[in-house]
Interface confidence: low
Amino acid sequence: WQVRRPPTWGQVQPKDVPRSWGHGSSPALEPLEAEVRKQRDSCQLVLVESIPQDLPFAAGSLSAQPLGQAWLQLLDTAQESVHVASYYWSLTGPDIGVNDSSSQLGEALLQKLQQLLGRNISLAVATSSPTLARKSTDLQVLAARGAQVRRVPMGRLTRGVLHSKFWVVDGRHIYMGSANMDWRSLTQVKELGAVIYNCSHLAQDLEKTFQTYWVLGVPKAVLPKTWPQNFSSHINRFQPFQGLFDGVPTTAYFSASPPALCPQGRTPDLEALLAVMGSAQEFIYASVMEYFPTTRFSHPRRYWPVLDNALRAAAFSKGVRVRLLVSCGLNTDPTMFPYLRSLQALSNPAANVSVDVKVFIVPVGNHSNIPFSRVNHSKFMVTEKAAYIGTSNWSEDYFSSTTGVGLVVTQSPGAQPAGATVQEQLRQLFERDWSSRYAVGLDGQAPGQDCVWQG
């Protein structure tokens, strides 16, 4: 590309527009598959997170690897291709009219991506149309250096958005989690995700989900009634991937939403969540930005108690300890609180029914100039058996019309040199947040009270 294209709602044409389903549709998959078979997997999973600036936890608190560091490292490992699915891109401060030094990590990431293209590593981006970041020029900048960009018209196709957030690097490494390609995700918003290294089986399975977006990003694309066979997955909740992660016996699979973008063999995201909840016998701890047992974006709004019922049933019928940590920020919709109070009202310790709900408030401090920040954007759940890391908020639309992915991981505890299982690490991160001064019980949150840190 010789031109940095001006902002446009139209299609950024990649070099390889597919002529038919499943033929020539992959930006870099075919040559990689053969390559990857020659290499032995030695999967490793690392939890990653962003802790907003000026959000100190108690000294000695556990923490995951910083997300910005993990992203830069992933790009350093890239040798052939980087495929990114992200709701929107906004890696520089002026994108949103902000001049703040905390955007520099995002700008460093954009610089790294430009260097990557200079090294003849292919970059393919699937992003949402419509987008939130209308003024961002990140993708024009990258297209100028040769990136292939497709804007997936989920609004037209399913009345949703492309809300997924994941990377597939060289068909071997993965990032997935709550963070968009946004500088605020690195320094101003609390995020949680996972990086999986050297795991071609899982990476190429997630790549198939990327390919569903890719083929829908061409002009006049339509949703297929049945997805072609080459999009099918053989890794799902009935047949998870089984392998050693740092020597620890592990099962894992990726789920996806909406069902219309789940080719044969792909476990729908909602089904994965319900399965993890259903298998819990001791506890279910969930941290999500939003919790609505309703639709959120379709009108008239419908009641949708699927996840709510599953939590209630686990607590009431099996005595599972349920803890729900929901974000509370300046942009939080206050109509969420009655649903949270209703869920907590089920709690009855005398009858061994334990349901606790807290809101997590990130102090705004002197960062009030940065819009849509200072929130806990994480979307994860952990039980004694499994870790679930997702990209979706908990309301109907995210599972019925909007794209997302989930990662379900179970590790066998035992005498392992590598330390705690993934689910134990995630539990500890949850407990850190839950017991911190930023997590406030609903009783401390008066009806209609703003989500402003009271200190």
Epitope: P94, Q111, G118
Partner: antibody, heavy 118, light 107 residues
Framework: QVQLQQPGAELVKPGTSVKMSCKAS????????MHWVKQRPGQGLEWIGD????????NYNEKFKSKATLTVDTSSSTAYMQLSSLTSEDSAVYYC???????????WGQGTSVTVSS | DIQMTQTTSSLSASLGDRVTISCRAS??????LNWYQQKPDGTVKLLIY???RLHSGVPSRFSGSGSGTDYSLTISNLEQEDIATYFC?????????FGGGTKLEIK
């Protein structure tokens, strides 16, 4: 610290070619674009093109496509620009500059003064 | 190509003055605007990149602002060492293009 070293001057005859160098130090040469910029006496700056030493990828200003050829030698961390079929219009100072964050040219060489004269 | 126009080709100011140099692009360049200083001996330095980001080692008296097509460089407290020619450059659309320069002199 980042340094870009260029020879001070070149005197060449019309119709011939000249190949000027830019030796980089103080950073990873293969990780940054190298730009070349022309400045005629008493005039402004004109971007000629850039090259990525890690892969030899190049971009050229259309105006200089048949005039300039950009190359690198990664073993010596040196970028080169060859100008061909020289005329008096090519008499100028030529700068190399490293492409830094967001494509800003963050470090510049001292410039090579090329004089085309018979 | 995008044309970059610096309407003031030369500017006289006194030491200690606040000086503003402007630059206009022929189309929206989305903040991809850089400012350079060229000393009389030909030495070129980056001052500001991406409209308002100060390059390392540049004194804080230099600042940049703007958006869309209109941008400016401000020197808040002019010093003798600031005597130079200042160029703007857009990095939004290849080929990168420079303004004609503004020569700053002491009154």
């Amino acid at each position: 610290q980042v340094q870009l070293q260029q020879p001070g001057a070149e005197l060449v005859k019309p119709g011939t070619s000249v190949k000027m160098s830019c030796k980089a130090s103080g950073y990873t040469f293969t990780s940054y674009w190298m730009h070349w910029v022309k400045q005629r006496p008493g005039q402004g700056l004109e971007w000629i093109g850039d090259i990525y030493p890690g892969s030899d990828s190049t971009n050229y200003n259309e105006k200089f496509k048949s005039k300039a050829t950009l190359t690198v030698d990664t073993s010596s961390s040196t970028a080169y620009m060859q100008l061909s079929s020289l005329t008096s219009e090519d008499s100028a100072v030529y700068y190399c500059a490293r492409g830094g964050w967001l494509d800003a040219m963050d470090y510049w060489g001292q410039g090579t003064s090329v004089t085309v004269s018979s | 190509d995008i044309q970059m126009t610096q309407t003031t080709s030369s500017l006289s100011a006194s030491l200690g003055d606040r000086v503003t140099i402007s630059c206009r692009a022929s189309q929206d360049i989305s903040n991809y605007l850089n400012w350079y200083q060229q000393k009389p001996d030909g030495t070129v330095k980056l001052l500001i990149y991406y409209t308002s980001r100060l390059h390392s080692g540049v004194p804080s008296r230099f600042s940049g602002s703007g958006s869309g097509t209109d941008y400016s460089l401000t020197i808040s407290n002019l010093e003798q060492e600031d005597i130079a020619t200042y160029f703007c450059q857009q990095g939004n659309t290849l080929p990168w293009t420079f303004g004609g320069g503004t020569k700053l002199e002491i009154k």
